[in-house]
């Protein structure tokens, strides 16, 4: 049993990060076997933290391969029956000791998760899990607390409405105080610590114990058959059946005698006292969230999980917040639906990640009658009189640019501006000079032009202005219609997409 850098992972790391002494704690969490996201749901079957943790102090050049681990067992009490299939989560926490602002610092070094099958009362199961550069070797087993017995820790207590109602000779049942303890069904004298029964008058032994009442440790039990124990660690003195007779090791394990007992050297993929426990295979479905299990078609080979988008971890048990990677461009809103990622795009952008900058003014709203103008790979708003700013939302002073020529006075008006011209000038912007003899009116610039008939000239100017205005209005109408069509198209698509999102979120 160890926790340290895995093989071939470079220079062994210290868990203390060269910051003085630290301690390792292990948090064990058990969840029902069907738990979807093993790190996100509650430890419904129970949880426990290791105690009696030795302090680890890093010394220069010292290998971190063998770290001092917590002494003894981590016991995880569980309620009710033992499910047999469960999710085992083991977290390795580091407590940095010494002077730190705010007291000791805690860090999660590693978390391993796996789906397991295990009958209560069985032998220790061994396992090795790797996460990142760390490797954890551990063993686990499930044991029933009396009066629960059997592979599923079935209760042997009879239901009663209250402890006070328990019949003669019966006590309240533990750990189920609302029930009464049933009369003993095991063989009289059967060890309550090392034996259990599933049928009346039987005494089955837990791993490591033997004898009719499960009171004899396995280390001396092989001498019961016409042998007597010899001095310490010399085995048995009289001939008789040996502990390896009949090969108690299953699945091709090889047996060797040790201290009057036996030890099985198990082939890869098997473990347990008699190599009776096999490893998890892909057929067991160890990968959460639909992950693809690769390898592990037999217990000799370790499995690897290939996770769907949005999940990670050795068993695809951790959900990734994919929106934290900000996949939606151009200010799009990110929605992680679990099985899919959706981007709700701002006006003017489209595509699964809002990556397409719409190639016209369809998504660009220019306020207050402004028109959208393209050019040079960008778009801008050409604002109506009296408005300015990027989207024509700001009120502008039409007189700020001094539009009235030749000293004309500017007056702001709700529909634009009016120029009061100085004597000798006329026109919308006072741009025409009036001859003193009243013969003709000439545009102030260019000065070379002269008109014989001022009336005809003015009519021509007005006609030109009218044509230009009509052209501008027609252009605006065309732009508005095309923009409305495009907006309707994208709104329709967006409404459909939002409906999809709503359905998917509800699902």
């Amino acid at each position: 049993h160890s926790f340290g850098p895995g093989p071939g992972l470079g220079t062994p790391r210290s868990p203390c990060n060269a910051r003085g002494p630290c301690r390792l704690f292990f948090r064990v969490c058990l969840k029902p076997g069907v738990s979807q996201e093993a790190t996100e749901s509650l430890c419904a079957l129970g949880a426990a933290l290791s105690t009696s943790v030795p302090v680890y102090t890093e010394h220069p050049g010292e290998s971190a391969a063998a770290l001092p681990l917590p002494d003894g067992l981590v016991r995880v009490p569980f309620r009710d029956a033992w499910p047999g299939t469960f999710s085992l989560v083991i977290e390795t926490w580091r407590e940095q000791l010494g002077e730190h602002a705010g007291g000791p610092a805690w860090n999660l070094l590693a978390r391993v998760v796996g789906r397991r099958r295990l009958a209560a009362g069985g032998p220790w199961a061994r396992d090795v899990q790797r996460t990142g550069t760390w490797e954890l070797h551990f063993s686990y087993r499930a044991r029933c607390e009396p009066p629960a017995v059997g592979a599923a820790c079935a209760r042997l207590c009879r239901s009663r409405s209250a402890p006070s109602r328990c019949g003669p000779g019966l006590r309240p049942c533990t750990p189920f105080p609302d029930e009464c303890e049933a009369p003993s069904v095991c063989r009289p004298g059967c060890s309550p610590e090392h034996g259990y029964c599933e049928e009346p008058d039987e005494c089955r032994c837990l791993e490591g114990w033997t004898g009719p009442l499960c009171t004899v440790p396995v280390s001396t039990s092989s001498c019961l058959n016409s042998r007597v124990p010899g001095p310490a660690s010399t085995g048995c003195l009289l001939p008789g059946p040996g502990p390896c007779d009949g090969n108690p090791c299953a699945n091709g394990g090889s047996c060797s005698e040790t201290s009057g007992s036996f030890e099985c050297a198990c082939p890869r993929g098997f473990y347990g006292l008699r190599c009776e426990v096999s490893g998890v295979t892909c057929a067991d479905g160890p990968c959460f969230n639909g992950g693809l299990c690769v390898g592990g078609e037999d217990p000799d080979s370790a499995y690897v999980c290939h996770c769907p988008p949005g999940f990670q971890g050795s068993n695809c048990e951790k959900r990734v917040d994919r929106c934290s990677l900000q996949p939606c461009q151009n200010g799009g809103l990110c929605l992680d639906l679990g099985h899919a990622l959706r981007c709700r795009c701002r006006a003017g952008f489209a595509g699964p990640r809002c990556e397409h900058d719409l190639d016209d003014c369809a998504g660009r709203a220019c306020a207050n009658g402004g028109t959208c103008v393209e050019g040079g790979g960008s778009r801008r708003c050409s604002c109506a009189l009296g408005f300015g700013g990027r989207d024509c939302r700001e009120r502008a002073d039409p007189c700020a640019s001094r539009p009235c020529a030749h000293g004309g006075r500017c007056y702001a008006h709700f529909s634009g501006l009016v120029c009061a011209c100085a004597p000798g000038y006329m026109g919308v912007r006072c741009e025409f000079a009036v001859r003193p003899d009243g013969a003709d009116a000439v545009p102030a610039a260019p000065r070379g032009l002269r008109q014989a008939d001022p009336q005809r000239f003015l009519a021509g100017v007005i006609a030109v202005i009218v044509v230009v205005v009509i052209a501008i209005v027609a252009g605006i109408v065309v732009l508005v219609i095309s923009r409305k069509k495009r907006m309707a198209k994208y709104e329709k698509a967006e409404i459909k997409e939002m409906g999809e999102m709503h359905r998917e979120l509800n699902a």
Epitope: Q36, G285, L292, C293, L337, A340
Partner: antibody, heavy 117, light 107 residues
Framework: EVQLVESGGGLVKPGGSLRLSCVAS????????MNWVRQAPGKGLEWVGQ??????????HYAESVKGRFTISREDSKNTVYLQMNSLKTEDTAVYYC????????WGQGTTVTVSS | NIVLTQSPATLSLSPGERATLSCKAS??????VSWFQQKPGQSPRLLIY???NRYTGIPARFSGSGSGTDFTLTISSLEPEDFAVYYC?????????FGGGTKVEIK
């Protein structure tokens, strides 16, 4: 050995109903997402729908083309997933496969559904 | 839905030759592309996952490459049992979608 065996296919008139079954063996069925994928004659593969685990409240997802007409359910105690097909159309004619997981790793041999008048 | 376009539709080759099949996605799918093989009268079989990883039990002559929108399945030296229809599938965005298939036939 992992095996998925589909059944329940046959000839049905447009507007009719059919229920397909897929029985799994060799896997811990309750730990696997299950999908239905179909293949029209001479055509490519089309995902039909998916059912997830008990821990996901048996969440289901469907292709747009079958939404509201097809229903997927599962019975973990029987290692079986079902596809209930209602209001069948001629374009639903295909071989229907059940597959596992998100990546369709294990496949059944398929069952043929023919919708014709 | 993401559209996958496979080319060519048919590939006529002799045993021992190298086969190169193409799959183009309508948008970025990262490396979430799988390749499936389907022989006449049989169900599809997963060959490659994650664009370039061989699935359990798949011979080394099959290899996949690509990321983003362009993906390739290569069969380095065609064996008689490799003549079949090959489909690419994307698993980046739900729902999963498949290409139209490429038929590898004996010349």
């Amino acid at each position: 050995e992992v095996q998925l065996v589909e059944s329940g296919g046959g000839l049905v008139k447009p507007g009719g109903s059919l229920r397909l079954s897929c029985v799994a063996s060799g896997i811990t069925f309750s730990n696997f997402w299950m999908n239905w994928v179909r293949q029209a004659p001479g055509k490519g593969l089309e995902w039909v729908g998916q059912i997830r685990l008990k821990s996901d409240d048996y969440a289901t997802h469907y292709a747009e083309s079958v939404k509201g007409r097809f229903t997927i359910s599962r019975e973990d105690s029987k290692n079986t997933v079902y596809l209930q097909m209602n209001s069948l159309k001629t374009e639903d004619t295909a071989v229907y496969y059940c597959t596992t997981g998100y990546y369709f790793d294990y496949w059944g041999q398929g069952t043929t559904v023919t919708v014709s008048s | 839905n993401i559209v996958l376009t496979q080319s060519p539709a048919t590939l006529s080759l002799s045993p021992g030759e190298r086969a190169t099949l193409s799959c183009k996605a309508s948008e970025n799918v990262g490396t979430y592309v799988s390749w499936f093989q389907q022989k006449p009268g049989q169900s599809p079989r997963l060959l490659i996952y994650g664009a370039s990883n061989r699935y359990t039990g798949i011979p080394a002559r099959f290899s996949g490459s690509g990321s983003g929108t362009d993906f390739t399945l290569t069969i380095s030296s065609l064996e008689p049992e490799d003549f079949a229809v090959y489909y690419c599938g994307q698993f980046y965005s739900f729902p999963s979608t498949f290409g139209g298939g490429t038929k590898v036939e004996i010349k």
